[in-house]
Interface confidence: low
């Protein structure tokens, strides 16, 4: 007759924290007579999980009635799994002996891994705004996951970023882990509506990654471009000069007109036109009475944006 | 001695079309001697799926070697599953008899359901545009899914809608099913950038729902608001009157200026300013030579938008 084999069909079982884990084990024969036991780990330091013969194992239930005649199924279920239960479990057949039963054969083992989901990633950006062409840093953090293997990717408007550094802590074995990543993002003028996304993939998420986002509008300052032009006027003794302030972000802007270096008028931009890219435009005009001037006039449009140093553009108005 | 039990551990098994289905069955004893058979359905009309003793079953393979001494595992695998294979499968033990074997005991049955994915949902909107405060209907359709259980949700800009009617056809059993839903959406002035989303969740989609979208920009017409104002002018003999045409969609717009009811100028809007909400603004101005008028002048800004009836706003210009 073929010698008894101990079959543990699953090499590995992965269970979410809080669930029950079923560890399967079957014998191929009823002979030799003797009990089975389940252990976690192998060798001298192995931990008894279940003994068919004796003992109290409140979290363990058997899948079949082990006392039943002809039973060959010695599978067990362990309830309320925590990460501390991870390890390799062995189903071991003993042969009836005197005074003690003797270990006869062991199954190949089933590795139990315990899964815990990462927390929703939190993305934070720089404390102060930066201008286009400069690099800013964003951080992403997530905690409480197990196993340790995790993938973190950064995206800007759907395009994957590559300039980032990621750490998973702790380095050694732990009940759960944390991830921290810092990405460096180069700002462009069109980034007011841009978003950075931190995407985390983990075995517990079944292919549906967690994402944390941050808006670059909180991190960017786009300085305005100025254009001063003269508009046609039907009245001969008047000139209409406009200052087009274009593509700035955020809103805060103060404009001053100077005639030959002397302040003529100061305005705070209120009714702004928003561009498709999220930046703003504003236009101010100055009506100049040419009769009041004998010589040519230099008109200067001076703009202070978001508390930064003023920029200006001048226009020479010819008095003919 | 305990009597043999036929164990079918899974109450139900769900398989995707084209996959193999494993139906598990185990006996608790080697006695009595006799073959096992698998049937679909119960009673007189049941269909033989597999007979251990005889016959040719090309799509069926056994999981264990049934001829092996002491074998108690009578699980089978059926390849290339189609929706037509759905049903309840029974593992039945027969006792050797003469001339025929006699049915001894049946397992509790395993219900095999076959999964087929729904097609990508197609969303269509109304044939003609409607204005804000009016209700428009959107339809969503998806086909070819199984089982019949399916969830359909409607969203507008991420907010779930409740005013919709959904039907799944046919009402009775079928190889596959279709879903049709009609949602009623109240338009608002800010809906140019809005989207309606039809979201379908089904067991085959592994928690990743299918979505179909439609843009409300195809369904909405936002009529303009008009404002006529006089701008300050330093030149005494001229008045600058502007007509601000605000928040209209779609683009098509023609503006006519009338002085005391007589057409002064007609313009077609070209360079428009786009607002954050997707509507457009446009401004036209009229320079009026006040010297040419002895009495007050009524200036009228008349706008025809998107082929609709014209709207107008007048301004009384005082000639002092």
């Amino acid at each position: 007759e073929d010698e008894l084999q101990v079959i543990q069909p699953e090499k590995s079982v992965s269970v979410a924290a809080g669930e029950s884990a079923t560890l399967r084990c079957a014998m191929t024969s009823l002979i030799p007579v003797g009990p089975i036991m389940w252990f976690r780990g192998a060798g001298a330091g192995r931990e008894l999980i279940y003994n068919q013969k004796e003992g109290h194992f409140p979290r363990v239930t058997t899948v079949s009635e082990l006392t039943k005649r002809n039973n060959l199924d010695f599978s067990i279920s362990i309830s309320n799994i925590t990460p501390a239960d991870a390890g390799t479990y062995y189903c071991v057949k003993f042969r009836k002996g005197s005074p003690d039963d003797v270990e006869f054969k062991s199954g190949a083992g089933t590795e139990l891994s315990v899964r815990a989901k990462p927390s929703a990633p939190v993305v934070s950006g720089p404390a102060v705004r930066a201008t286009p062409e400069h690099t800013v840093s964003f951080t992403c953090e997530s905690h409480g996951f197990s196993p340790r293997d995790i993938t973190l990717k950064w995206f800007k408007n759907g395009n994957e970023l590559s300039d980032f550094q990621t750490n998973v802590d702790p380095a050694g074995d732990s009940v759960s882990y944390s991830i921290h990543s810092t990405a460096r993002v180069v700002l462009t003028r069109g980034d007011v509506h841009s978003q950075v996304i931190c995407e985390i993939a983990h075995i517990t998420l079944q292919g549906d990654p967690l994402r944390g986002t941050a808006n670059l509008s909180e991190a960017i300052r786009v300085p305005p471009t100025l254009e001063v032009t003269q508009q046609p006027m039907r009245a001969e003794n008047q000139a209409n000069v406009t200052c087009q302030v274009s593509n700035f972000y955020p809103r805060g802007l103060q404009l001053t007109w100077l005639e030959n270096g002397n302040v003529s008028r100061t305005e705070t931009a209120s009714t702004l036109i928003e561009n498709k890219d999220g930046t703003y435009n504003w236009m101010s005009w100055l009506l100049v009475n040419t009769c009041a001037h004998r010589d040519d006039v230099v008109l200067t449009c001076q703009v202070e944006h978001d508390g930064q140093q003023a920029v200006s553009k001048s226009y020479a108005l010819e008095i003919s | 001695e305990d009597e043999l039990q036929v164990i079918q551990p899974e109450k139900s098994v769900s398989v995707a079309a084209g996959e193999s289905a494993t139906l598990r069955c185990a006996m608790t004893s080697l006695i009595p001697v006799g073959p096992i058979m698998w049937f679909r359905g119960a009673g007189a009309g049941r269909e033989l799926i597999y007979n251990q003793k005889e016959g040719h079953f090309p799509r069926v393979t056994t999981v264990s070697e049934l001829t092996k001494r002491n074998n108690l595992d009578f699980s089978i695998s059926i390849s290339n599953i189609t929706p037509a294979d759905a049903g309840t499968y029974y593992c039945v033990k027969f006792r050797k008899g003469s001339p025929d074997d006699v049915e001894f005991k049946s397992g509790a049955g395993t219900e095999l359901s076959v999964r087929a994915k729904p097609s990508a949902p197609v969303v269509s909107g109304p044939a003609v545009r409607a204005t804000p405060e009016h209700t428009v209907s959107f339809t969503c359709e998806s086909h070819g899914f199984s089982p019949r259980d399916i969830t359909l949700k409607w969203f507008k800009n991420g907010n779930e809608l409740s005013d919709f009617q959904t039907n799944v056809d046919p009402a009775g059993d079928s190889v596959s099913y279709s879903i049709h839903s009609t949602a009623r959406v109240v338009l608002t002035r800010g809906d140019v950038h809005s989207q309606v989303i039809c979201e379908i969740a089904h067991i085959t989609l592994q928690g990743d729902p299918l979505r179909g979208t439609a843009n409300l920009s195809e369904a909405i017409r936002v009529p303009p608001t008009l404002e006529v104002t006089q701008q300050p002018m330093r030149a005494e003999n001229q008045a600058n009157v502007t007509c601000q045409v605000s928040n209209f969609y779609p683009r098509g717009l023609q503006l006519t200026w009338l002085e005391n009811g007589n057409v002064s100028r007609t313009e077609t809007a070209s360079t428009l300013i786009e607002n954050k909400d997707g509507t457009y603004n446009w401004m036209s101005w009229l320079l009026v030579n006040t010297c040419a008028h002895r009495d007050d002048v009524v200036l009228t800004c008349q706008v025809e938008h998107d082929g609709q009836q014209a709207v107008s706003k007048s301004y009384a210009l005082e000639i002092s």
Epitope: S14, D149, S162, D163, F164, A201, Q206, G207 | -
Partner: antibody, heavy 117, light 108 residues
């Protein structure tokens, strides 16, 4: 232990079809993607694409769109790779490799395909 | 797509010698997604170094990896006959994933 076992060598004529299998064992098949890599004789490695073993959704590199198809039989923990309308330049060894969080940690032994008239 | 160029394509080294293989990318690659594989004739590739500098299971400590951005390298501190093989760098930082052309390392 974890293993990827591929089907045996194939000798085909131009215009024919071939289907290569890759059977996984020792881990939960649907937790890890499966990638396919081509190595022409005496040449380097070329990544062809991958299949999501949970959703069965394939992703192909531009050079391998059209005649190539990835598929699965998840219940048998097996991934497949098919080439239709074979050409001489398809002669190569094709590898399956496990993806996931540590890309390419396990590879199949390779399947040698020879296309010759 | 990111093209990975390995140099030199072929090199030979004496036992005990220090060897450095380089891998240069046409655009920046995340260090987390730069891997090295070893392949011997008639065998499938083996994961050798992952995430730029981590040795895969069973890889001798004489191997090390380093780099960032567009420039990466694999170093053997003292060459042994068992190290004779082809080494391929691989990025899966962005689609499509790509391999370098390989460096064939021979023993003198």
């Amino acid at each position: 232990q974890i293993q990827l076992v591929q089907s045996g060598p194939e000798l085909k004529k131009p215009g024919e079809t071939v289907k290569i299998s890759c059977k996984a064992s020792g881990y939960t098949f649907t937790h890890y993607s499966m990638h396919w890599v081509k190595q022409a004789p005496g040449k380097g490695l070329k990544w062809m694409g991958w299949i999501n073993t949970e959703t069965a959704e394939p992703t192909y590199v531009d050079d391998f769109k059209g005649r190539f198809a990835f598929s699965l039989e998840a219940s048998a923990s097996t991934a497949f790779f098919q080439i239709n309308n074979l050409k001489n330049e398809d002669t190569a060894t094709y590898f399956c490799a496990r993806g996931g969080l540590r890309q390419g940690d396990y590879w199949g032994q390779g399947t040698t395909l020879t296309v010759s008239s | 797509q990111i093209v990975l160029t390995q140099s030199p394509p072929i090199m030979s080294a004496s036992p005990g010698e220090k060897v450095t293989l380089t891998c240069s990318a046409t655009s920046s690659v995340s260090a987390s997604y730069l891997y090295w594989f070893q392949q011997k004739p008639g065998s499938s590739p083996k994961l050798w170094i992952y995430s730029t500098s981590n040795l895969a299971s069973g890889v001798p400590a004489r191997f090390s990896g380093s780099g960032s951005g567009t420039s990466y390298s694999l170093t053997i501190s003292n060459m042994e006959p068992a190290d004779a093989a082809s080494y391929f760098c691989h990025q899966w930082s962005s689609y499509p994933y790509t391999f370098g052309g390989g460096t064939k390392l021979e023993i003198k």
